[in-house]
């Protein structure tokens, strides 16, 4: 009996530019002789329904149809036909199929590969054209994929130490697509510093599919207006 097992759940998520290993494990009733078996990996794009051969292994020969694609002969001996793809790109997302032949038996499995890119986040203070006592804080998130992203603003005061979401005076712009397929977006918070307590901590909170925990950039309102430190003005996260 020959069986193939892919990633549990049928989906694998990988970061952009990573060296991804797409899992494919072989279960066979006898010890595997790699000289008399075949492995073929196929890829089907998200955008068109045509299947393309990525890698082929047959006995004493292997061929990569995607540069750098490889199945380890040394892992194959112990039933691991996983495909290594170095420097994975956004356009390589889609369905991957692992086909195993141990003559006369054949088994296959499929997995969906999702490629994600994590946003970098930075805070900027924009004072241009602002009225007296009025500040505009911009939270820029860049280089993320997929497009769906959630940016919120929170504040913590000495009176209320638990974060409170700010819903007023927040404008989040449209997402902009970059040349490399990733996205950027900017969210703005308008503040009237005369009405806010010094010592209040404001946070821009970015939630995205690529992040295990939200990305947080913060600044503290000081008694002297606009006295943000340079690092607070351009708080970089990756």
């Amino acid at each position: 009996d020959l069986k193939v097992e892919m990633m549990a759940g049928g989906t694998q998520i990988t970061p952009l530019n990573d060296n991804v290993t797409i899992f494919c494990n072989i279960f066979y009733s006898q010890p595997l002789n790699i000289t008399s078996m075949g492995i073929t990996w196929f890829w089907k794009s998200l955008t068109f329904d045509k299947e393309v051969k990525v890698f082929e292994f047959f006995g004493d020969h292997q061929e990569a149809f995607r540069p750098g694609a490889i199945v380890s002969p040394w892992r194959l001996k112990s039933g691991d036909a996983s495909l290594r793809l170095p420097g994975i790109q956004l356009e390589e997302a889609g369905e991957y199929r692992c086909e195993v032949v141990v003559t006369p038996l054949k088994a296959q499995g499929t997995v969906q590969l999702e490629v994600v890119a994590s946003p970098a986040s930075r805070l900027l203070l924009d004072q241009v054209g602002m009225k007296e006592n009025e500040d505009k804080y911009m939270c820029e998130s860049s280089g993320f994929y997929p497009e769906a992203i959630n940016i919120t603003w929170e504040k913590q005061t000495q009176k209320f130490p638990h974060p409170i979401e700010i819903s007023e005076d927040v404008i989040t712009g449209p997402t902009i697509k970059n040349m490399d397929g990733t996205f950027n977006v900017t969210s703005c918070l308008k503040l009237n510093s005369s009405q806010e307590d010094p010592g209040t901590v404001y946070q821009c909170v970015v939630r995205h599919a690529s992040l295990h925990t939200p990305l947080r950039s913060n600044f503290t309102l000081t008694a002297a207006r606009h006295s943000l430190s340079e690092t607070e003005k351009t708080d970089n996260f990756s």
Epitope: N19, T21, F23, W74, R75, K77, S78, D80
Partner: antibody
């Protein structure tokens, strides 16, 4: 920085078992196999087998089959090698070594070694 | 099993002079155009360290005075100018077939 840190020296009686651990750090544990190699006093190197942390699959040197068990705990990036029914000629330094498996096959980083002495 | 025979088993070299070690395999260690032969150096009291893999590729951080050549069954490790720090035992290893086997070792000493 890639590091493989092995457990301390062991003294065992004939017929007993020994379990050596190898804690890996500085790289993605599942991207490489772990080889186990031993060296008897004043002797050369002998490959015992390897384990694939990706699926737990093992390849053992026929010489040790039935006596050796290699396992991994991916949650703590640690590989283990257990050798049972010890004999005096199992007295050796046991090494774990990180093994590249995609672009060739070679052991590029080695643990410091664990001395196992089998004596009655 | 593939048997690897190293020659010489020991050699004594004057610093600055070249050295050469041969490794012969009982059968070919080539597969799909590549040679699966590796070279290691074991310095006294230390674990082995990788010098060369795939017959001729220098491992990162290894001085370029070391070089490897050969294919099929005949392989050579060369040191263009031996230095005091090169003392130890040199092993060839094949990784084409299991069990992966080592040569018996060549001890390099400084004159």
């Amino acid at each position: 920085e890639v590091q493989l840190v092995q457990s301390g020296a062991e003294v065992k009686k004939p017929g007993a078992s020994v379990k050596v651990s190898c804690k890996a750090s500085g790289y993605t544990f599942t991207d490489y196999n772990m080889d186990w190699v031993r060296q008897a006093p004043g002797q050369g190197l002998e490959w015992m087998g390897d384990i694939n942390p990706n699926n737990g699959g093992t390849l053992y040197n026929q010489k040790f089959r039935g006596r050796v068990t290699m396992t991994v705990d991916t949650s703590i990036s640690t590989a283990y090698m257990e050798l049972s029914r010890l004999r005096s000629d199992d007295t050796a330094v046991y090494y774990c070594a990180r093994s590249e498996v995609f672009y060739g096959n070679y052991a590029d980083y080695w643990g410091q070694g664990t001395t196992v002495t089998v004596s009655s | 099993d593939i048997v690897l025979t190293q020659t010489p088993l020991s050699l004594s070299v004057t610093p600055g002079q070249p050295a050469s070690i041969s490794c012969k395999a009982s059968q070919s260690v080539d597969y799909d155009g590549d040679s699966y032969m590796n070279w290691y150096l074991q310095k006294p009291g230390q674990p082995p360290q990788l010098l060369i893999y795939a017959a001729s590729t220098l491992h990162s951080g290894v001085p370029d005075r070391f070089s490897g050549s050969g294919s099929g069954t005949d392989f050579t490790l060369k040191i263009s100018r031996v230095e005091a720090e090169d003392v130890g035992v040199y092993y060839c290893q094949q990784s084409k077939e299991d069990p992966r086997t080592f040569g018996q070792g060549t001890k390099l000493e400084i004159k």
